[in-house]
């Protein structure tokens, strides 16, 4: 049956009607409205924007729109005592200081409350010492320094370039290496694309531009003071010393003009190879310390930021389902920005706004979705996904019983080359089918489908004629829904050409230069890519909320489970002798995957053939589909990461942004050759294999015939 038949309404209220109502001009207008002043989490400006969105969503026709507030730990620079880094001479005199703020972009010189660049949640401190350059501060970079080059970071201030991995992982690695402070900087090799001018003349990062960002290692905990529970008025709060995920050493970000001044004097060891060298005119020596003439000079950090419990506000809008009001499809994205949020998050928030408007228009004409749709404007995402996590903690019992799907809606663009999708395998077929019905916005693909341009520009590495869909990692608001609660999740945005643009993120990410003009002049003047993303996100929500049978295909999970089992087995097989010595076998896991594949296949046949006019049977089959993602949740969580509970996927322990498959086994195997007690280490591998086997088998059994 078509979606329109689901709620017995006139055929004009179908997916096409919803998609046709979405307008690029509206998205443009909303983006402009959302980006004129900063909307930093915890500020009055962001509260006012929450109230504006609440009011407009009501006008658009949602059944109810509520503000939900929480009191969470946030972090701000000291207004009267700015953060900076100095080069000091032997007398302690400051001979160079890093900048105190970014030069504001033209037209924004008189805007107040632009927060200067800082690393959110850095502790206060004034460490002083020699500098060590640690490349991207990845796990492998510290292995190279400590194991191969025998360089000790203990007591040193490390300087790391942004990119490749989440900044919080960099800080964690530096802490573990014994560093007393961390300086993060944007190297032009990563944030300046060749042949493009810097802002305001192009989309590249100017030398004074700096990337803000939090440096937490929350591992899904939400508010650092109330892990597992909502930060409401009766919440018990931990002391700051017991807070989750806070860094223990001062951290500060700088731009490449300032980095040049610090790096040009570096002495000590030469960089190990070209992968450690950026594009500045400096030697990229590793250190420690400055070269001959400057060897008596040191680096000193001056960090005075404070962490304080602050009120944040989510906006939650409801469009009640006509047939299954107790089944929730959620579309959520954040509202808080570091400064103007031209891309992050407001290019996403503007799309959500237009999607709400379109759904509201249909509702005003008498239509309702089959299932309830919840719309969310999250607060404090930039401070650790706090708004979404606190709301999910507060509503976890409802969500785990009623949550069908979560579609994330942060930045709609990070480039203008092709589509990028990360989602659960359950949604692969939904995404393929939807993109085949949408028109490509790409030049040279006029009259062709989005699926076609996406497949051509971003082909699947495994299956010819299909586009790439990536694993979900973290670093965004789907985290709690997917990794903690096991709700099927997905995200879509327009992205850059990863082949030719090797820089990390987009150059102006989290800087003051992320403005409306950046988007309107350089990324998407016609807002056609924004419109396409609105169609993909909105279309997914429409189908998830309105299809009679949930548009999930469990067979696609079977395919990836086999792929992931092969991958982890191959990693383990790099140690054949130890596998033999400790009797490590993956046979049980492969057997469970085989069982899953067979049961999923039989389930799909039943799904095709059952009587869809029988509401009990329909509900039963849909529940099996809805609860399949939930079946991959281990209530005990992953080792040392209790809020990452999905056994098939977790954020990488070495890069929060990346997804890892069979993470429990992967982490048990990681660097196993260096473990002091190999017997215990291989025992943990065996334990993790057994957990994965049990989970896959248990998930398979949820798809078996009920009686």
């Amino acid at each position: 049956k078509s979606s329109s038949e689901a709620t017995n309404i006139t055929p004009k209220h179908n997916m096409k009607a919803f998609l046709d109502e979405l307008k690029a001009e509206n998205i443009k207008k909303f983006l402009h409205n959302f980006t004129q002043i900063p909307h930093l989490a915890g500020t009055e400006q962001n509260f006012q924007l929450a109230k504006q969105i609440q009011s407009q969503w009501k006008e658009f026709g949602l059944d109810s729109v509520e503000l939900t507030h929480y009191d969470v730990l946030l972090s701000y620079p000291n207004k009267t005592h700015p953060n900076y880094i100095s080069i000091i001479n032997e007398d302690g005199n400051e001979i160079f200081n890093t900048s105190l703020f970014e030069p504001p972009p033209a037209g924004y010189e008189n805007v107040s409350d632009i927060v200067p660049p800082f690393s959110a949640f850095s502790p206060q401190g004034m460490p002083e010492g020699d500098l060590v350059y640690v490349n991207y501060a990845r796990t492998e970079d510290f292995f190279k320094l400590e194991r191969d080059m025998k360089i000790n970071c203990s007591g040193k201030i490390v300087i790391a370039r942004y990119g490749k991995v989440f900044r919080g992982n960099k800080v964690k690695n530096a802490q573990l290496a014994g560093a007393t402070g961390v300086i993060l900087y944007s190297d032009p090799a990563d944030y300046f694309a060749p042949g493009v001018k810097s802002y305001p003349d192009g989309w590249n990062l100017p030398g004074g531009g700096v990337q803000r960002g939090n440096i937490l290692n929350l591992n899904g905990a939400g508010d650092p003071l109330t892990p597992g529970y909502p930060a409401n008025e009766y919440a018990y709060r931990r002391g700051i010393a017991e807070a989750v995920g806070l860094p223990s050493i001062p951290v500060h970000p700088i731009g490449y003009y300032d980095a040049q001044k610090l790096l040009e004097k570096m002495g000590g060891s030469a960089s190990p190879d070209s992968s450690w060298r950026g594009s500045l005119k400096v030697p990229y020596n590793v250190g420690p310390g400055f070269t001959g003439n400057f060897s008596t000079q040191k680096v000193k950090m001056h960090i005075h930021s404070t962490s304080e419990v602050t009120r944040i506000y989510n906006v939650i809008g409801t469009l009640r389902g006509a047939v299954e009001p107790d089944r929730y499809v959620i579309l959520g994205g954040h509202r808080d920005s570091w400064v103007f949020g031209g891309i992050d998050p407001q290019s996403g928030a503007a799309v959500v706004h237009e999607i709400v408007r379109s759904f509201g228009t249909l509702k005003k004409e008498g239509w309702r979705p089959r299932r309830t749709i919840l719309f969310a404007s999250w607060d404090a995402e930039e401070f650790g996904l706090l708004g979404s996590t606190e709301w999910a903690e507060e509503n976890s019992r409802l969500l785990q019983e009623r949550g069908v799907a979560y579609i994330n809606a942060d930045s709609s663009i990070e480039g203008n080359y092709t589509l990028r999708v990360d989602c659960t395998p359950l949604m692969y077929s939904l995404v393929y089918n939807l993109t085949k019905e949408l028109e490509s916005p790409d030049e040279g693909f006029e009259g062709k489908s989005l699926y076609e341009s996406w497949t051509k520009k971003s082909p699947s590495p495994e299956f010819s004629g299909m586009p790439r869909i990536s694993k979900l990692g973290s670093g965004n608001d789907f985290e709690v829904f997917f990794q903690r609660l096991g709700i099927a999740s997905g995200r879509a945005r327009y992205t850059k050409n990863w082949e030719t643009n090797k820089f990390s993120s987009y150059p102006l990410y989290h800087s003051v230069y992320e403005t409306y003009e950046l988007v309107e002049k350089f990324y998407d003047p016609m807002f056609k890519y924004h419109l396409t993303v609105a169609q993909v996100r909105g279309g997914m929500v429409f189908e998830l909320a309105n299809s009679v049978v949930l548009p999930f295909d469990c067979r696609d999970y079977a395919v990836v489970l086999r792929k992931y089992a092969d991958k982890i087995y191959n990693i383990s097989m790099k140690h054949p002798q130890e596998m033999k010595t400790y009797s490590v076998s993956f046979d049980s896991l492969f057997s469970a995957v085989k069982n899953f594949t067979e049961i999923a296949s039989k389930f799909s046949e039943r799904l095709r053939d059952f009587d869809k006019s029988n509401p009990i049977l329909l509900r039963m089959m849909n529940d099996q589909l809805m609860f399949l993602e939930r079946a991959f949740i281990d209530p005990l969580g992953l080792p040392d990461r209790p809020f990452y509970r999905h056994v098939i996927y977790a954020p990488s322990s070495h890069n929060k942004y990346a997804g890892e498959s069979f993470p429990g086994i992967y982490d048990a195997l990681f660097d196993i050759e260096s473990k002091v007690d190999p017997s215990q280490a291989w025992g943990e591998v065996k334990r993790q294999i057994s957990i994965a086997t049990f989970t896959v088998q248990a998930a398979a059994e949820t798809l078996s015939e009920v009686a």
Epitope: F96, L100, E102, P103, P104, A106, P206
Partner: nanobody, 123 residues
Framework: QVQLVESGGGVVQPGRSLRLSCVAS????????MHWVRQAPGKGREWVAV????????YYADSVKGRFTISRDNSKNTLYLQMNSLRPEDTAVYYC????????????????WGQGTTVTVSS
């Protein structure tokens, strides 16, 4: 239009003080490093001092170090030069100048100059 207007010059006795001002208009003052440069009668231009766009760094010519202080008030689009312990050799026309490149400090890369204000140190 883009302009820099200096003021505060005059005739002063050796050992005394003077404060020069330079009001900027027509460009985002807050985003650019600013310099003071001087030209003594019959001589070439001599760089005096520079301040970064945010005031975080200030550098001086050896000839004025410890006596002159460069400062700025971004809310007033104004650059200052406080000159103490003035000497006859400080006699010159003082110009303020704007850095050409947004957000960076260079020793001699200026694109906008004021018309100058004359300082005469004489007993």
């Amino acid at each position: 239009q883009v302009q820099l207007v200096e003021s505060g010059g005059g005739v002063v006795q050796p050992g005394r003080s003077l404060r020069l001002s330079c009001v900027a208009s027509g460009f985002p003052f807050i985003s650019y490093g600013m310099h003071w440069v001087r030209q003594a009668p019959g001589k070439g231009r001599e760089w005096v001092a520079v301040i970064s766009y945010d005031g975080s760094n200030r550098y001086y010519a050896d000839s004025v170090k410890g006596r002159f202080t460069i400062s700025r008030d971004n809310s007033k689009n104004t650059l200052y030069l406080q000159m103490n312990s003035l000497r006859p050799e400080d006699t010159a026309v003082y110009y303020c100048a704007k850095e050409r490149i947004f957000g960076v400090l260079t020793p001699d890369d200026f694109d906008i100059w004021g018309q100058g204000t004359t300082v005469t140190v004489s007993s």
